[in-house]
């Protein structure tokens, strides 16, 4: 028996009542040690116990009036009072007492963290941790095995196992994502350590296998056949090839490479969207040079971990046959342009040079030539250019011609080339005065005075610099009034050979001058220099002679 520490008069046993009882249960008895059994004491419950518990007022027996659920409430704290009915007063102070609800195994284990999902790499070794599941049991863990749980695998063999006491799920057999990528595992949790009468609960775990790069890409076609026109420009797509990889995502990203292409004519790039290999033309092809190509292409993954490298040895290859299709191509001149030289003055019909164009195609069509750009030339069937007129370098030193070659088998196929004809100089022009000289001598000129400086020009082209030679004509015997001196620099001076001239005696002198060039053979011209006598006055300057001469000619005398 227990006694209340504060109130020594109360006596009761520890109260325990089982949960889940369908009938009224006797819990125990409260009594006061002052109670002598003469039925004058009355027992009362106060407070919270009113609904679930009742007390026999005469005996102090306590009863559970309804089914109790330990998992809802495991302890009840009640207050009791004892009254002596003869005097109508409490004989003991109010006291609290406790009723404990004892556990029965009425709750199954429950998985509270559902849904369970786990991801684990494919081909993970045995023993790899996948996920831990935990079941909770609401029963009293201190009451026998009511809340002692064991786990077992209901579905998932042979790939998974569960540790019975921890709920840790591990891999028990390697799995290949490419065969199956999702697994459904069912775990059962039993209380009572699985003994008879145990309650159980189950949960489902969805386990996804993540991809590892354990598959290399493989060409489904062992070879491909493409055709390309020889007129296709570089950069043209020839065709597309495709390898397949059972992996996904980054592990399926692949790279194509050309293994053997000595010609370096093809390239391959990847279409990142479709993972196709696009074969492109890197350099133009020429049917006449090579019309069949073969290239071997290798495919490999872009991202391969070192430990998975063994799965990627002996990369898959495919062979591509490329057939070049012939295009009728225009003629090709043997040179990009032609430069010919011909001396001027040659008779018409003189051969200038020969151009030549060929058909690059196999049929080797003959050519027909035509020429535009000048009526001075013509071209014959062999591509030989001839003159049709006398050429004069001093009229035109260069001719810019255009020659066209047309295939006789296909007149649509035409090409043209520039022909530059240089007319070479021959010495066919004698030198002459560089200008028309107005030369004057003053009446009061002194002997040896420079009357005029002269120079010459020559319409011929000079390989080096022209050199001119000046001489007073030997025919000009009657003219001793002037002398000529060659300066040896392509100029000469005319000097007065006497002192004083008179307008009354002679108004004008004509001096015959010979000018020779340095051509081979040299050419000489006869040139007349007119020297007019002028009244210069005291100044002895010829600056005003032109106007004076004009007035003189008009019949006036200038003072």
């Amino acid at each position: 028996d227990y006694k209340d520490d504060d109130d020594k008069g109360w006596v009761w046993k520890q109260f325990v009542v089982p949960e889940e009882m369908d009938t009224i249960q006797h819990v125990g008895r409260l009594r006061s040690d002052l109670d002598n059994g003469n039925n004058s004491f009355q027992y009362k419950l106060l407070g919270t116990g009113d609904g679930s518990f009742s007390i026999d007022e005469k005996t102090g027996d306590i009863f559970a009036m309804q089914k109790l659920d330990r998992e809802k409430q495991s302890l009840y704290i009640l207050r009791a009072q004892v009254i002596d009915t003869t005097i109508g007063k409490a004989v003991e102070p109010e006291s609290e007492f406790v009723i404990r609800v004892s556990d029965v195994n009425d709750n199954e284990p429950r998985f509270l963290d559902e849904p369970y999902e786990a991801i684990v790499p494919e081909m993970s070794p045995e023993g790899t941790f996948v996920i831990k599941v935990t079941a909770n049991d609401a029963d009293d863990p201190t009451s026998g095995y009511h809340a002692r749980i064991l786990y077992n695998l209901e579905q998932g063999q042979p790939y998974f196992s569960v540790e019975p006491t921890t709920g840790v799920i591990r891999i028990s057999s390697k799995m290949d994502r490419e065969l199956q990528d999702t697994y459904c595992v069912i775990i059962q949790a039993k209380d009572m350590l699985g003994q008879p009468g145990a309650l159980s609960g189950t949960t489902t775990i969805s386990i996804k296998l993540s991809d590892i790069n354990d598959n290399k890409p493989i060409f489904k076609e062992s070879f491909y056949r493409f055709t390309i026109s020889e007129s296709a420009p570089s950069g043209t797509t020839i065709g597309k090839i495709m390898a397949y990889d059972d992996d996904i995502g980054e592990n399926a990203e692949m790279d194509y490479s050309i293994e053997d292409d000595e010609s370096q004519i093809f390239d391959i790039v990847i279409d990142n969207e479709t993972q196709e290999g696009i074969v492109i033309l890197k350099k133009k092809v020429d049917f006449e040079h090579q019309n069949h190509y073969g290239i071997r292409v290798k495919v490999k993954n872009c991202h391969v971990d070192e430990e998975l490298a063994p799965a990627h040895v002996n990369a898959s290859t495919t062979y591509i046959k490329v057939q070049v299709e012939d295009e009728d191509e225009p003629p090709t001149f043997l040179l990009p342009y032609y430069i010919f030289e011909i001396p001027e003055g040659k008779p018409y019909g003189t051969m200038v040079g020969t151009v030549s164009a060929v058909d690059p195609d196999r049929r080797q069509s003959p050519m027909r030539y035509s020429l535009i750009g000048s009526k001075m030339f013509d071209i014959n069937g062999n591509g030989t250019i001839v003159t049709t007129n006398l050429l004069d370098r001093e009229v035109s030193a260069w001719y810019n011609l255009s020659v066209t070659a047309t295939e006789t088998y296909n007149v649509q196929q035409i090409s043209s080339a520039h022909v530059y004809v240089q007319v070479l100089n021959i010495n066919d022009h004698a030198p002459e005065f560089s200008q028309l000289y107005e030369t004057y001598v003053c009446e009061n000129a002194e002997s040896g005075e420079i009357i005029q400086t002269i120079s010459a020009i020559d319409r011929d082209e000079s390989i080096e610099d022209h050199h001119f030679y000046f001489n007073h004509s030997v025919e000009d015997t009657n003219n001793s009034s002037f002398i000529l001196t060659d300066n040896q620099d392509n100029t000469a001076v005319i000097l007065s050979n006497r002192a004083g001239f008179s307008l009354k005696e002679e108004t004008v002198f004509y001096m015959i001058i010979l000018i020779a060039d340095n051509g081979i053979p040299p050419l000489t011209s006869t040139n007349t220099l007119t020297i007019q006598v002028c009244d210069c006055g005291d100044s002895r300057s010829t600056e005003t002679c032109t106007s004076k001469e004009l007035l003189f000619i008009m019949g006036f005398k200038a003072e």
Epitope: R225, D261, E262, E288, H289, H292
Partner: antibody, heavy 120, light 107 residues
Framework: QVQLQESGPGLVKPSQTLSLTCTVS??????????WSWIRQHPGKGLEWIGY???????YYNPSLKSRVTISVDTSKNQFSLKLSSVTAADTAVYYC????????????WGQGTLVTVSS | EIVLTQSPGTLSLSPGERATLSCRAS???????LAWYQQKPGQAPRLLIY???SRATGIPDRFSGSGSGTDFTLTISRLEPEDFTVYYC????????FGPGTKVDIK
Amino acid sequence: QVQLQESGPGLVKPSQTLSLTCTVSGGSISSSGYYWSWIRQHPGKGLEWIGYIYYTGSAYYNPSLKSRVTISVDTSKNQFSLKLSSVTAADTAVYYCARDGSSGWYFQYWGQGTLVTVSS
Amino acid sequence: EIVLTQSPGTLSLSPGERATLSCRASRNISSSYLAWYQQKPGQAPRLLIYGPSSRATGIPDRFSGSGSGTDFTLTISRLEPEDFTVYYCQQYGSSFTFGPGTKVDIK
């Protein structure tokens, strides 16, 4: 294993047209990527390629014979044929049909050949 | 067209000896575009080597090919009695042409 068999007349008169057929067995003539050729060998001489055809019907001929040659294909019969017009005695030869390889334009499979004599 | 020249025209050797057959092209060809054939009397040619060193299916390893550019070689390391016959080279880059052949006969 692909097998090829040539058939056709063994004697053709000058100026006429030589016609031969090659029947393919052990594989489809429509197999993607393969070219079907005709090759000839003059008696005691070397080999001369005549031309080839793809199952789609596109053909390519030896330029020196191009003006006289026609090669055609009949996929339903798994056959391809050669026609060589305006024949002369110089066309007397053993005619072979052949198929190229999967790794190049070499000739991997050959028929046993048929001798065609051009004579009046 | 590319012209192939084979030398020697005839090669006289004994069984067990090494045979070296040459094939020369009139202009450069990629080594990927050359093949060798064996032809026995009354039979069709038989592919030996392509590309120029890959052996065709069923070809014994005593046959090997090499070369590049314009010069190519077929080597038979130890001649067997059945190897005494005619050998042709073929280029398949610019159209298709064959060499005139080399005859290997028993000395």
